[in-house]
Amino acid sequence: LEASEEVELEPCLAPSLEQQEQELTVALGQPVRLCCGRAERGGHWYKEGSRLAPAGRVRGWRGRLEIASFLPEDAGRYLCLARGSMIVLQNLTLITGDSLTSSNDDEDPKSHRDPSNRHSYPQQAPYWTHPQRMEKKLHAVPAGNTVKFRCPAAGNPTPTIRWLKDGQAFHGENRIGGIRLRHQHWSLVMESVVPSDRGTYTCLVENAVGSIRYNYLLDVLERSPHRPILQAGLPANTTAVVGSDVELLCKVYSDAQPHIQWLKHIVINGSSFGADGFPYVQVLKTADINSSEVEVLYLRNVSAEDAGEYTCLAGNSIGLSYQSAWLTVLPEEDPTWTAAAPEARYTDHHHHHH
């Protein structure tokens, strides 16, 4: 290298895989400028695990590693990590070459590449790179899905990570499907979780200086098939004036395809109930859930005869659910009068209609 040259990787774009794990020989006294990522979103540079400050003789700034004049203590391993993650964009070892001023022929060039022989960088205990994300403890995941635990950390020397489940070393050997580890992403992945995966998962991050840990509490949820669930309070008791329009709403939740009916309670031979004890009803509307407007019963131009009890009945392959409400119809000449209608009934019984 000529004395006037800078060591430079161009263009300043995120490198391809082929650009990773490079060795560069740099002459003493030579300026260095290494680029990593786009200037606005360039990665962060680390030397031997310590993030470089944006100012100083050796600095990491806007995705660039800049060394004003290369010195023996600048030799070593440099990493550029993507912002917001621990993805390695650049992995470089700078080696001291021929001096532009004076050289020490007795010096072992490998000594600048072996962190164990170097004491010029400050050691640092592990720390979380995004501590604000390490707050939510309990996580509930439906069975059959995949869970990813991550504990991105840094330190000097670069920490190692290991995982515990319920306080015991966890390698997934007893788990169907095993586990997937990505140490460079500080992650543990478990595919197709089952109830036996419930527990406390601990990432233990440690180096020679210290250690930190974080607990994830995992709950695996199982779905038991159930009959339709009706939203509480719907349909709601309603008061209307003769001649007006009324809408009764019924919100249905169901895994299995539900079938919905709107029923009006009627009186037959002076009785509201049959010999079997179930009420007499008239089916006003029936449809599947994916029919439009099925969860709304429209009553147009209501009359006094429309007053009474209405029921939303929803059924699926598992069972039936229903809720009822009262419609009170007031005469036109007295709109201020309000009836004390019975409360809407929220029941869990199977419903029978004739």
Epitope: S85, K136, H139, G144, V147, K148, V189
Partner: antibody
Framework: EVQLVESGGGLVQPGGSLRLSCAAS????????ISWVRQAPGKGLEWVGR????????NYADSVKGRFTISADTSKNTAYLQMNSLRAEDTAVYYC????????????????????WGQGTLVTVSS | DIQMTQSPSSLSASVGDRVTITCRAS??????LAWYKQKPGKAPKLLIY???FLYSGVPSRFSGSGSGTDFTLTISSLQPEDFATYYC?????????FGQGTKVEIK
């Protein structure tokens, strides 16, 4: 063995409706989902929408929102894509795909991955 | 919507070649990226999820890497059955979006 079989495709006039079915076997819907993806002739893949069985939620691409509806009958292990107000640009092969979630607990979001796909059914919208 | 741009759009390669396809997102998608392979007249098949995790049953010659906006699918030694179109897809943003595809053809 996981299998997905689409049916219901065919020729329909602009403005018309069609309902596609996706019959699944080898797994149950209860805690995963079904996505619909389409591919116009000679073109790339376009995500249409997703049904998430755990909470019954649905999500749609803007291009079909308000016109297409995804539903499912978990007792039959079948998902449906109801397509209304069809347009010529809806012409495509429609695939259904089993969809599972990758719950990334660190960033607290779910990545949705489509791991098993049906063979596809062709929908042609033309007058 | 998050735009996914694949490059190249097509490439010619020989059996045994190392092939690299890149995918760039218009905004940060963390590691929420999957790769799919599709042969003509067939449904897509999942290869990689979460940017770098090999889906079960997929040969180990496939690998994925990247995070944020830049991702790579690598086939270390191309096999005859690998000639197909490859799609990347993100699902961190709504709606899920695919890249336009990269067609790998026989040289």
């Amino acid at each position: 063995e996981v299998q997905l079989v689409e049916s219901g495709g065919g020729l329909v006039q602009p403005g018309g409706s069609l309902r596609l079915s996706c019959a699944a076997s080898g797994f149950t819907f209860t805690s995963t989902g079904i996505s619909w993806v389409r591919q116009a002739p000679g073109k790339g893949l376009e995500w249409v929408g997703r049904y998430w069985a755990w909470d019954g939620s649905t999500n749609y691409a803007d291009s079909v929102k308000g016109r297409f509806t995804i539903s499912a009958d978990t007792s039959k292990n079948t998902a449906y894509l109801q397509m209304n107000s069809l347009r010529a640009e809806d012409t495509a092969v429609y695939y259904c795909a089993r969809t599972y979630g990758i719950y990334d607990l660190y960033v607290d979001y779910t990545e949705y991955v489509m791991d098993y796909w049906g063979q596809g059914t062709l929908v042609t919208v033309s007058s | 919507d998050i735009q996914m741009t694949q490059s190249p759009s097509s490439l010619s390669a020989s059996v045994g070649d190392r092939v690299t396809i890149t995918c760039r997102a218009s905004q940060d998608v963390d590691t929420s990226l999957a790769w799919y392979k599709q042969k003509p007249g067939k449904a897509p098949k999942l290869l990689i999820y979460s940017a770098s995790f090999l889906y079960s049953g997929v040969p180990s010659r496939f690998s994925g890497s990247g995070s944020g906006t830049d991702f790579t699918l690598t086939i270390s030694s191309l096999q005859p059955e690998d000639f197909a179109t490859y799609y990347c897809q993100q699902s961190t943003g709504h709606p899920q979006t695919f890249g336009q595809g990269t067609k790998v053809e026989i040289k």
